[in-house]
């Protein structure tokens, strides 16, 4: 008779390991399904029920990933005015921001916008800087503007410019987390920033 296929969760045979895309849950003492990269374990497995996976919400990424899935979803960084996206965020990595180089600008607070070139003017009314496009005196620039470049001056942020910008001030996703002592941290002596 062929061996039966074991469906998760199941107790592994003594001396054996869990299969590919499974992990051994110490609490349940069972082989359970891993969540796919970028997903988090919404509900961890028990002796009778398998892992329930969920993705981090749009605009968030997995900051703390583990073999059983994501432990902590976090909002993607937003690059402030004067800074653009150097490396986009992925399911498991945050956005990396960089200062806009001379001749480029970003006037948005965004987790997707890159630095764009200043428009080229016949006569410059206001020179561009890292957080503002150039303003021309003539009605149109000599060369076609970069796609999406702005004609009118934008308000310059008065806040200090950080290369580590603002996450969304929205409510966190409900992530289940295995704590050492139930709902509260241990007496002596957590995860996140």
């Amino acid at each position: 008779l062929p061996a039966q296929v074991a469906f998760t969760p199941y107790a592994p045979e003594p001396g054996s390991t869990c299969r590919l895309r499974e992990y051994y849950d110490q609490t349940a003492q069972m082989c359970c399904s891993k969540c796919s990269p970028g997903q988090h374990a919404k509900v961890f497995c028990t002796k009778t029920s398998d892992t329930v996976c969920d993705t981090c919400r749009p605009g968030w990424y997995c900051a703390l990933s583990k073999q059983e899935g994501c432990r902590l979803c976090a909002p993607l960084r937003k690059c402030r005015p004067g800074f653009g996206v150097a490396r986009p965020g992925t399911e498991t990595s945050d956005v990396v921001c960089k200062p806009c180089a001379p001749g480029t600008f970003s006037n948005t607070t965004s987790s997707t916008d890159i630095c764009r070139p200043h428009q080229i003017c016949n006569v410059v009314a206001i020179p561009g800087n890292a957080s503002m496009d150039a303003v021309c005196t003539s009605t149109s620039p000599t060369r076609s503007m970069a796609p999406g470049a702005v004609h009118l001056p934008q308000p310059v942020s008065t806040r200090s410019q950080h290369t580590q910008p603002t996450p969304e001030p929205s409510t966190a996703p409900s992530t289940s987390f295995l704590l050492p002592m139930g709902p509260s941290p241990p007496a002596e002596g957590s995860t996140g920033d």
Partner: antibody, heavy 121, light 111 residues
């Protein structure tokens, strides 16, 4: 017993470098974000940096670009590489574990005893 | 200057109730949960209250936290001499993408 033990502090000249280590024990190290918090002599607490997995890290404005946080999960150790040190970096540096039930609910729940870094010529 | 504002000192006699305030903004206290830390003289800080009003196991119920809008408070009832310490509030700040602390309040137990 859950424990964090910092090392690597000492006297360094301005412009110099130093690497702090924090050895963790008594818990599953890679389940947690880890942080560095410092306290200048006679002053209050100042957050320095936090790391989650990989290079998912955050830095305080006063150290960004000079300090680098990293972790070695196989060694249960957290590091802080401090470059271009200044007199104002003189402080006791604490390693702290970050408890998280969600992004909005986080706290430093375990602290080490601290290691003193003195930047002086 | 600290992002979160605390009174530099507070005092009370044994058995009294003392409250320490912590004032912030919409990007820190209002948007995120507040934690309180106790630092006894010559020791490392210890988590006292997390998630606005939760006590870790081992922290006496004489300590309680509350939050309203952009302000938070730590209350200590039945004050004891061993409560003499520095107390710090802290919260994540969305605008700074970092943790911010209050300047600390030195609590003195009189008598």
């Amino acid at each position: 017993e859950v424990q964090l033990l910092e090392s690597g502090g000492g006297l360094v000249q301005p412009g110099g470098s130093l690497r702090l280590s924090c050895a963790a024990s008594g818990f599953t190290f890679d389940d947690y974000g880890m942080s560095w918090v410092r306290q200048a002599p006679g002053k209050g607490l100042e957050w320095v940096s936090t790391i989650y997995s990989g290079d998912n890290a955050y830095y305080g404005a006063s150290v960004r670009g000079r300090f680098t946080i990293s972790r070695d999960n196989s060694k249960n150790t957290l590091y802080l590489q401090m470059n271009s040190l200044r007199a104002e970096d003189t402080a006791v540096y604490y390693c702290a574990r970050v408890y998280s039930s969600s992004w909005r609910k986080r706290a430093f729940d375990i602290w080490g005893q601290g290691t003193l870094v003195t930047v002086s010529s | 200057q600290s992002v979160l504002t605390q009174p530099p000192s507070a005092s009370g006699t044994p058995g009294q109730r003392v409250t320490i305030s912590c004032s912030g903004t919409s990007s820190n206290i209002e948007s995120n949960t507040v934690n309180w830390y106790q630092q006894l003289p010559g020791t490392a800080p210890k988590l006292l209250i997390y998630s606005d009003n939760q006590r870790p196991s081992g922290v006496p119920d004489r300590f309680s936290g509350s939050k309203s809008g952009t302000s938070a408070s730590l209350a200590i009832s039945g004050l004891r001499s061993e409560d003499e310490a520095d107390y710090y509030c802290a919260a994540w700040d969305d605008s700074l993408s970092g943790w911010v602390f209050g300047g600390g309040t030195k609590l003195t137990v009189l008598g």
